[in-house]
């Protein structure tokens, strides 16, 4: 098994991830590992020489780059926040700020926008990945209600009057809770509070 540098007549190298074809000398040379860059190119008699990326720069993959990429912060103006710092081996990891979703994607999220409100009687469908898309509002399931316009409010179960020693004065809807009353008191017509003790 040849070790780099070695001649390659068919312009391909055995280990595509860790080696590359150098056309000038028609040889296969080692790539530099993540966190490093090429400080001296290979020749027929000497393999690639790699050096560690300087502070504030990185290379994520096996490479034959002569520079490292500059670390960049997540852009808060674009609604992004940082979840992990840049290191010599990876770029800064960003995500949408809470209450936002990714509206523009170019290999990674570049722009986040505010999640839409879900109207009363609905809630946002739970997604596998937070921040991946705008809210899709779905109706509250039977026996639940949600009484605000909000991007994040969840449907809550209707109050069970009997659990509190009360009786139902008005049934709950998708947008309002059950109204309960003391079993000994009639409900005045103007009362619309959730619970009367």
């Amino acid at each position: 098994q040849a070790v780099p540098p070695y001649a390659s007549e068919n312009q391909t190298c055995r280990d595509q991830e860790k080696e590359y074809y150098e056309p000038q000398h028609r040889i296969c040379c080692s790539r530099c590992p993540p966190g490093t860059y090429v400080s001296a190119k290979c020749s027929r008699i000497r393999d690639t020489v790699c050096a560690t990326c300087a502070e504030n720069s990185y290379n994520e993959h096996w490479n034959y780059l002569t520079i490292c990429q500059l670390c960049r912060p997540c852009d808060p103006v674009m609604g992004l926040e940082e979840i992990a710092p840049c290191t010599s081996k990876r770029k800064t990891q960003c995500r949408c700020q809470p209450g936002m979703f990714c509206a523009a994607w170019a290999l990674e999220c570049t722009h986040c926008e505010l999640l839409s409100d879900c109207p009363p009687g609905t809630e946002a469908e739970l997604k596998d990945e937070v921040g991946k898309g705008n809210n899709h509002c779905v109706p509250c399931k039977a026996g639940h209600f949600q009484n605000t316009s909000s991007p994040s409010a969840r449907c809550q179960p209707h109050t069970r009057c009997e659990n509190q020693g009360l009786v139902e004065a008005a049934p709950g809807t998708a947008q309002s809770d059950t109204t309960c009353k003391n079993p000994l008191e009639p409900l005045p017509p103007e009362m619309s509070g959730t619970m009367l003790m």
């Epitope: 504030n56 912060p73 808060p76």
Partner: antibody, heavy 116, light 107 residues
Framework: QVQLVQSGAEVKKPGQSVKVSCKAS????????LHWVRQAPGQCLEWMGW????????QYNEKFKGRVTITADKSTSTAYMELSSLRSEDTAVYYC?????????WGQGTTVTVSS | DIQMTQSPSSLSASVGDRVTITCKAS??????VAWYQQKPGKAPKLLIS???YRYSGVPSRFSGSGSGTDFTLTISSLQPEDFATYFC?????????FGCGTKVEIK
């Protein structure tokens, strides 16, 4: 060479606020994150948050959100950490530190004592 | 938050001894772990970054190893100036978290 010089010790009463400064020199202030870390007596080191002076954006540890504010003045290459609604358990040494794969550079620390 | 559990919390050793300190992360942090030395009244000093890379100027008797969740700091031959407290830290994700320290004392 990189230097981070912090303001002097502070004694505060519960409920008050404290503002600690960290003056940076020996590097380009706007291109590196500055973090604040505290060490209470007999406690673990605790990361509070960072500021990126280039865009003056700060991000905080949820534990301190609403009580801590980190700011930076580019003209004087100085970062500030303000902690409000102080309580006795905030008695600690507060450090600023510049990050790169850990914290290679630290300020000398500022002792904040909270006592009635 | 990621917990960094360091052990032992203290140890007694003699000059020339080999000392091993371990740190366990509550979830995978890759190699994004640093080790620090701290002496009383002083700021911590970076010894190791990326789990195993010695910071410039750090003596070769200090070495780090590990990846994922289990990390080790080794002092191959303890010197008088090494009696101090040692901390691990993960910088894989925010919030950054630290181990609570290992105090290395003279036997």
């Amino acid at each position: 060479q990189v230097q981070l010089v912090q303001s002097g010790a502070e004694v505060k009463k519960p409920g008050q606020s404290v503002k600690v400064s960290c003056k940076a020199s020996g590097y380009t202030f706007t291109t590196y994150y500055l973090h604040w870390v505290r060490q209470a007596p007999g406690q673990c080191l605790e990361w509070m948050g960072w500021i990126y002076p280039g865009n003056v954006h700060a991000q905080y540890n949820e534990k301190f959100k609403g009580r801590v504010t980190i700011t930076a003045d580019k003209s004087t290459s100085t970062a500030y950490m303000e902690l409000s609604s102080l309580r006795s358990e905030d008695t600690a040494v507060y450090y600023c530190a510049r990050s790169w794969e850990g914290f290679p550079y630290w300020g000398q620390g500022t002792t904040v004592t909270v006592s009635s | 938050d990621i917990q960094m559990t360091q052990s032992p919390s203290s140890l007694s050793a003699s000059v020339g001894d080999r000392v091993t300190i371990t740190c366990k992360a509550s979830q995978n942090v890759g190699i994004n772990v640093a080790w620090y030395q701290q002496k009383p009244g002083k700021a911590p000093k970076l010894l190791i970054s990326s789990a195993s890379y010695r910071y410039s100027g750090v003596p070769s008797r200090f070495s780090g190893s590990g990846s994922g969740t289990d990390f080790t700091l080794t002092i191959s031959s303890l010197q008088p100036e090494d009696f101090a407290t040692y901390f691990c830290q993960q910088y894989d994700t925010y919030p950054f978290t630290f181990g609570c320290g290992t105090k290395v004392e003279i036997k």
